[in-house]
């Protein structure tokens, strides 16, 4: 057995049904993706052994289902997968990786064929623990790569403070497929928001540890880079879960109530 | 330049508790990790906790119960407490500092604790 | 947690070429890092390689590292090895903590 979660079942509806979906979300001009040759397109790694599938074997899903991401929106992230997608909102406010068609459609799925047959492993998939050219991670590298190469404007970079071995992941796929894809032509700045989990640990903030490998790296490039912790609209997201934690006491709030009574 | 320089009593009677510090300098302990990091005699290095720069720190877990490790900013200095002690616990003690908390580019020059009656 | 296991000693003449493995137990070093240290008798530890295969300023370019995804270790190779490089060498790598070889004693001859 490998050592990853097996293809999610009913894969195929999921991603049809994700696909038509978003759709509507896409402006007029660019609404007529053809869902099925998407599918078409993705499958191909489908018919690969586990082992060997490229990035570049998604090249036609990516070329079929692309499309712009508008200028300020793009909003990377580190070990905050579930915060990005609750705070983007489905577009509205940002638009990551899991908010453009190619992340969307196989966000939070898993899929691999069988090591020596023809049919879909529901059992387990191979993670980068078993071997490099997995499935799922050779599609995030690819639609990784795009999607740093269709960015622009203000990059917004959400990292977590929390996560033991640093905020800034030096070997990750923002680290390693991403920051080297930027157009540096197309980007005005850069803006990092290290969030810290509400009661979690304090392990880095801006300007610390690996932080600081991240913006000599990013300088070093010939970007305009800043960096805010606890990025206040992102924070009040993640006090909505914790209303009664010290760390998120609204002070303003509570004058205000004092006043009233 | 960068130093770190540990310090602590050489001697500890077993059940008690050690106590070393790791005085820092060339840099500040909240833009880089401190680590402690033992050595047994003609033994390997077995990595014991970290303080991160935001001030929370991490433990091996096999060593977690009895290990704290805390520090005082403006003094540049990394404090260690372990309580417990027995015999096994001899070894030289380092403390390390880490850009990133999964390596370490500079080392203390280590003081050595036997653990003995 | 893995396990990195190393040689516990290595012999080697002067001016050869020697490789310096460190094996990991379970998974591979897909998603870590692998960083080195040198250590000489009676000192501290020193890194000589860290991120699988960077240099720190100061070491001799006859270091150099690099992982073998076959045998699924990380190799330390040092060419042109001078009796000053007899020490030992630990490798060092990361899960939810902070993982150590066992190191291996390289012995010039």
């Known amino acids: 057995r490998w050592r990853g979660e097996g293809t999610s079942a009913h894969l195929r509806d999921i991603f049809l049904g994700r696909c038509a979906e978003y759709r509507a979300l896409l402006s007029p001009e660019q609404r007529n993706k053809n869902c099925t040759a998407i599918w078409e397109a993705f499958k191909v790694a489908l018919d690969k052994d586990p082992c060997s599938v490229l990035p570049s074997d998604y090249d036609l899903f990516i070329n079929l289902s692309r499309h712009s991401i508008p200028r300020d929106k793009s909003l990377f992230w580190e070990n905050s997968h579930l915060l990005v997608n609750s705070f983007a909102d489905n577009t509205r406010r940002f638009m990551p990786l899991s908010d453009v068609l190619y992340g969307r459609v196989a966000d939070f799925l898993s899929w691999c064929r069988q090591k020596n047959d023809s049919g879909l492993d529901y059992q387990s998939c191979p993670t980068s623990e078993d071997c490099e050219n997995n499935p799922v991670d050779s599609f995030w590298k690819r639609a990784s790569i795009q999607y740093s190469k269709d960015s622009s404007g203000v990059i917004h970079v959400m990292l977590n403070g929390s996560e033991p071995t640093g905020a800034y992941p030096i070997k990750g796929f923002f680290a390693d497929y991403e920051i080297p894809n930027l157009q540096k032509e197309k980007i005005t700045r850069i803006e990092i928001w290290v969030m810290h989990e509400i009661g979690g640990p304090n392990v880095e903030s801006c300007g610390e540890g690996s932080m600081k490998v991240l913006e000599k790296r990013l300088k070093d490039m010939g970007f305009q880079y800043s960096c805010i912790n606890d990025y206040r609209p992102v924070k009040l997201l993640q006090c909505v879960d914790h209303s009664t934690h010290p760390d998120c006491a609204l002070k303003s709030a509570a004058a205000a109530t004092q006043r009233k009574a | 330049q960068v130093q770190l320089k540990e310090s602590g009593p050489g001697l500890v009677q077993p059940s008690q508790t050690l106590s070393l510090t790791c005085t820092v300098s060339?840099?500040?302990?909240?833009?880089?990790?401190v680590s402690w990091v033992r050595q047994p005699p003609g033994k390997g290095l077995e990595w014991m906790g970290i303080i991160w720069t935001g001030g929370s720190t991490a433990y091996n877990s096999l060593l977690k119960s009895r290990l704290s490790i805390s520090r005082d900013t403006s003094k540049s200095q990394v404090f260690l407490k372990m309580n417990s002690l027995q015999t096994e616990d001899t070894a030289t003690y380092y403390c390390a500092r880490s850009i990133t908390p999964t390596f370490f580019d500079y080392w203390g020059q280590g003081v050595m604790v036997t653990v003995s009656s | 947690q893995f396990v990195l296991t190393q040689p516990n000693s290595v012999s080697t003449n002067l001016g050869s070429t020697v490789k310096l493995s460190c094996k990991r137990s379970t998974g591979n070093f897909g998603n870590n890092y692998v960083n080195w240290y040198q250590q000489h008798e009676g000192r501290s530890p020193t890194t000589m390689i860290y991120r699988d295969d960077k240099r720190p300023d100061g070491v001799p370019d006859r270091f150099s590292g690099s992982i073998d995804r076959s045998s699924n270790s990380a190799l330390l190779t040092i060419s042109n090895v001078q009796t000053e490089d007899e020490a030992d060498y630990f490798c060092q790598s990361y899960s939810s903590g902070i993982v150590f070889g066992g190191g291996t004693k390289l012995t010039v001859l």
């Open positions: 060339g840099f500040s302990l909240t833009s880089y990790h």
